[in-house]
Interface confidence: medium
């Protein structure tokens, strides 16, 4: 049975600033015909037929659900892209993470401006801070890492706060063992 394709993002963030670029790639096993990809944005078929969909100089209208399909294979699971205009944007490698998988958080400044005194918060409590900007790496996510995250920081000497982001860590499905 052919596998469902999977949409991946490069850079890996599904929350980006207006004007930024992101490439969506339709990955799957044994898809030899690279020009036979269908892309759907908010349910509408896109003109793009390559296995990669480039979003250049993102606009608010680029927000929404993206799916891809190779030949007769099932559509991929949807990926949701959000385009923002703000001073700070908290980005996550994924908003729903399987337990044991890595999770990366990034406090991203508008126009890639430097952000100083970056503080990451989880459920209203300071999680970690640096005087310069750093990403947060959680190597093995646990259910306890679920929560509402946001970051604060200084841009051009003024203090700003990102919109909150909900992260959910779900338990990995248990393997079934049968008695022989």
């Amino acid at each position: 049975v052919p596998q469902k394709p999977k949409v991946s993002l490069n850079p890996p963030w599904n929350r980006i600033f207006k004007g930024e670029n992101v490439t969506l790639t339709c990955n799957g096993n044994n898809f030899f015909e690279v020009s036979s990809t269908k892309w759907f944005h908010n349910g509408s078929l896109s003109e793009e037929t390559n296995s990669s969909l480039n979003i250049v100089n993102a606009k608010f209208e680029d927000s929404g659900e993206y799916k891809c399909q190779h030949q007769q294979v099932n559509e991929s699971e949807p990926v949701y892209l959000e385009v923002f205009s703000d001073w700070l944007l908290l980005q996550a490698s994924a908003e729903v993470v399987m337990e044991g998988q890595p999770l990366f958080l990034r406090c991203h400044g508008w126009r890639n401006w430097d952000v100083y005194k970056v503080i990451y918060y989880k459920d209203g409590e300071a999680l970690k801070y640096w005087y310069e900007n750093h990403n947060i790496s959680i190597t093995n996510a646990t259910v306890e890492d679920s929560g509402t995250y946001y970051c604060t920081g200084k841009v051009w000497q003024l203090d700003y706060e990102s919109e909150p982001l909900n992260i959910t860590v779900i338990k990995a499905p248990r393997e079934k063992y049968w008695l022989q």
Epitope: K117, E125, K128, W130, Y131, Q157
Partner: antibody
Framework: EVQLVQSGAEVKKSGESLKISCKGF????????IGWVRQMPGKGLEWMGI????????RYSPSFQGQVTISADKSISTAYLQWSSLKASDTAMYYC????????????WGLGTMVTVSS | QSALTQPRSVSGSPGQSVTISCTGT?????????VSWYQQHPGKAPKLMIY???KRPSGVPDRFSGSKSGNTASLTISGLQAEDEADYYC??????????FGGGTKLTVL
């Protein structure tokens, strides 16, 4: 009241090991970096290194890298500074200090631990 | 990572003003606003007097002020008082979560 309480004075011989402590009170210990500062007799302050007790992220001054180990036990709100083999030149007062991201400085200091190493 | 440069000693009479300089590089003092000043009386722990170049923590008299120009920060104490006699250290963030202190300045109130 926010305070850092350091362990008592130590007298040691060259080659011995030592671990001194700094316990935080009155604030969320895991959420602030703790720095260590050396002051040799009659000399100035030297920044040694710093630890974030929440995840044990640690940074060292190049001058102290490999000479000391900074660690923390967040379950008892305590940071540590340790030596595996002391030298006479380690004789000094050692201070721990709490970093404050809102002031960009060390706002709370321990009273210091005097370490005396005889050869 | 060299120590910041401070004068070894300064002195002044009660009521006068004194200024202590602290010279670093563009990698520390010149590169960040995170410059602090600490006061240390003999046998005591250092005490924060100025942070973020020029801000005073609550409880610190407004006779203490800080400034910065390029790679040099300054601490000015006006209306000098006997209890101001102490050692003063500047400190700067130096990037990647490292700090550097100055060599210290002994202030004598004549």
């Amino acid at each position: 009241e926010v305070q850092l309480v350091q362990s008592g004075a130590e007298v040691k011989k060259s080659g011995e090991s030592l671990k001194i402590s700094c316990k935080g009170f009155g604030y969320r210990f895991t959420s602030y970096w703790i720095g260590w500062v050396r002051q040799m007799p009659g000399k100035g302050l030297e920044w040694m290194g710093i630890i974030y007790p929440g995840d044990s992220d640690t940074r060292y001054s190049p001058s102290f890298q490999g000479q000391v180990t900074i660690s923390a036990d967040k379950s008892i709100s305590t940071a540590y500074l340790q030596w595996s083999s002391l030298k006479a030149s380690d004789t000094a007062m050692y201070y721990c200090a709490k970093d404050n991201p809102f002031t960009g400085s060390f706002d709370i200091w321990g009273l210091g631990t005097m370490v005396t190493v005889s050869s | 990572q060299s120590a910041l440069t401070q004068p070894r000693s300064v002195s002044g009479s009660p009521g006068q003003s004194v200024t202590i300089s602290c010279t670093g590089t563009s990698n520390d003092v010149g590169g960040y606003t995170y410059v602090s000043w600490y006061q240390q009386h003999p046998g005591k722990a250092p005490k924060l007097m100025i942070y973020d170049v020029s801000k005073r923590p609550s409880g610190v008299p407004d006779r203490f002020s800080g400034s910065k120009s390029g790679n040099t920060a300054s601490l000015t104490i006006s209306g000098l008082q006997a209890e101001d006699e102490a050692d003063y250290y500047c400190s700067s963030y130096a990037g990647s979560y490292t700090w550097v202190f100055g060599g210290g300045t002994k202030l004598t109130v004549l």
